[in-house]
Amino acid sequence: IPVIEPSVPELVVKPGATVTLRCVGNGSVEWDGPPSPHWTLYSDGSSSILSTNNATFQNTGTYRCTEPGDPLGGSAAIHLYVKDPARPWNVLAQEVVVFEDQDALLPCLLTDPVLEAGVSLVRVRGRPLMRHTNYSFSPWHGFTIHRAKFIQSQDYQCSALMGGRKVMSISIRLKVQKVIPGPPALTLVPAELVRIRGEAAQIVCSASSVDVNFDVFLQHNNTKLAIPQQSDFHNNRYQKVLTLNLDQVDFQHAGNYSCVASNVQGKHSTSMFFRVVESAYLNLSSEQNLIQEVTVGEGLNLKVMVEAYPGLQGFNWTYLGPFSDHQPEPKLANATTKDTYRHTFTLSLPRLKPSEAGRYSFLARNPGGWRALTFELTLRYPPEVSVIWTFINGSGTLLCAASGYPQPNVTWLQCSGHTDRCDEAQVLQVWDDPYPEVLSQEPFHKVTVQSLLTVETLEHNQTYECRAHNSVGSGSWAFIPISAGAHTHPPDEFLFTP
């Protein structure tokens, strides 16, 4: 560690005095301290002399000697007071800049240690400090305002009592800067804009930050626009707003608009697209297939996407039949706005009943006219089956009628014994009817098919079963010949109620 001569922690001299401070170390040594006038430095190998032959109050301060080659970075210091009766303070700075919550050192150095008892910190023009200002004083360093706040950005003076009167220092401006968390916050409204040629439009780009030092600009297709800036301060934030007003838009105004703001922390940008159209438009679409099939008893949501400008003047869902004149309940219709020009309309159809199959139309209107989008809803049903015994052209025939949607397939089974349903062990014969006769097939209704099984002789200890199935389910009917005629059996489990 270097050694300073004189070997005292502090030295008090009068103005005009000669001061010689010598520092000796193992290697080369360097003096440092507050930049001030009249000092001469002289180095001689492992010693360095700092001297003045005309000390002034401005030489008051702490002078440190270091040994640059010392890996431990040892240093020695001496504090010099130049005791000027006319100048109790040596102020090392005109301005002090700190971040919020840092300690702010106001470097008023007392030129006479005897005056320490009567020092105080005030705001300029003798105004008292703000409430909750927590500060301390060191005659070597000055006043420290602890955990400085933005609101404490003021002009301060150091005061000392000399002969019963207060002597003020020159003022020090304290600037407490907000800690900037990142680039300015941005808003660009609207997020999307559509206008018909000739209409007026407004785009507003605004940025805000806790610190006033930031820039904001609006650019159109990478060209910076010259727009007057409005500035404001509220909610402890600085705001800068750029407003682009277009009285009559044309196609050259269309395109990408970017709002860009930057500060020392970096840059933020956000963009929007401005579309200029020749006339009003209204487009309806759906991500769903317009032809829908749903099993009876289940639910369905019909969704329509609407793109429109100007906004919709009216819209509704309509049931077009064929079953009844009922209309969808308004509470089942729901509208959500995706953004200014795009909306989604949903019709909820829970627990569908047979009478609710048919066409549903969504109609919308704006100044561009009417548009409609129609869904066709067909209900799926599991087959219902019935079998009768009859004579056709003199031949005994089992006639099976199956009704359902989609169109059922028909299979005949002959099995031994009397049973409600043939099982594998009992089956004697199986006939598939690949082409049953379609008796009825109207839109939105069940399809009814008929299958004939010609039986020369009914075997009395046997069962004839007609089975029908489709993608929804299956149904069957067992026919049991008895001596007194024929007996038919629908299976116990077939008790379907939609």
Partner: antibody, heavy 117, light 110 residues
Framework: QVQLQESGPGLVKPSETLSLTCTVS????????WSWIRQPAGKGLEWIGR???????NYNPSLKSRVSMSVDTSKNQFSLKLSSVTAADTAVYYC???????????WGQGTLVTVSS | QSVLTQPPSASGTPGQRVTISCSGS????????VNWYQQLPGTAPKLLIY???QRPSGVPDRFSGSKSGTSASLAISGLQSEDEADYSC???????????FGGGTKLTVL
Amino acid sequence: QVQLQESGPGLVKPSETLSLTCTVSGGSISSYYWSWIRQPAGKGLEWIGRIYTSGYTNYNPSLKSRVSMSVDTSKNQFSLKLSSVTAADTAVYYCARERLGAFFDYWGQGTLVTVSS
Amino acid sequence: QSVLTQPPSASGTPGQRVTISCSGSSSNIGSNTVNWYQQLPGTAPKLLIYSNNQRPSGVPDRFSGSKSGTSASLAISGLQSEDEADYSCAAWDDSLNGPVFGGGTKLTVL
């Protein structure tokens, strides 16, 4: 070996604010005075101001109304802001370490700032 | 207009001794020490002399400084081609409360 590096935009529009940062490497920024100095083309050097690591500053009186400096010891950086610039502020800007005796022992390589629309 | 006055140019032949002057006032050179900087073309200034006549380590003893009253001078003996540069003087100014510089002298080695 202490090294200084200036950074910031090379072109600033008239009336806007010039912002430069000096990053110190190879040594600590603490307990030293750091200055900004500029040199217009073909002219002499001009001291702009200094900042100590505690945040206290002194500015050249001719520029005082437009200058602001700050220091960030955590990043080993100090910065300069010069507002309301004109073409007369076009210069090479240097950052430097100032020592007792008003001499500058370490300098950045300098950055040319042009003020033009 | 620089506060300290220097001749705009100086020249010498290799091996020669050249002197560059710097003149100020009582508020700067008259009451404070003088520092000298060398600026090679396209580079930053480099400290050459501090506190009137002190050389930082690495500066050849061909360079020397002196001060008298409100003037100072830099002497370069045994001039070499690599000495071709701009040389600026500087001093603390009491009224500025900071350093002031000369306008620089362009030294040409002929």
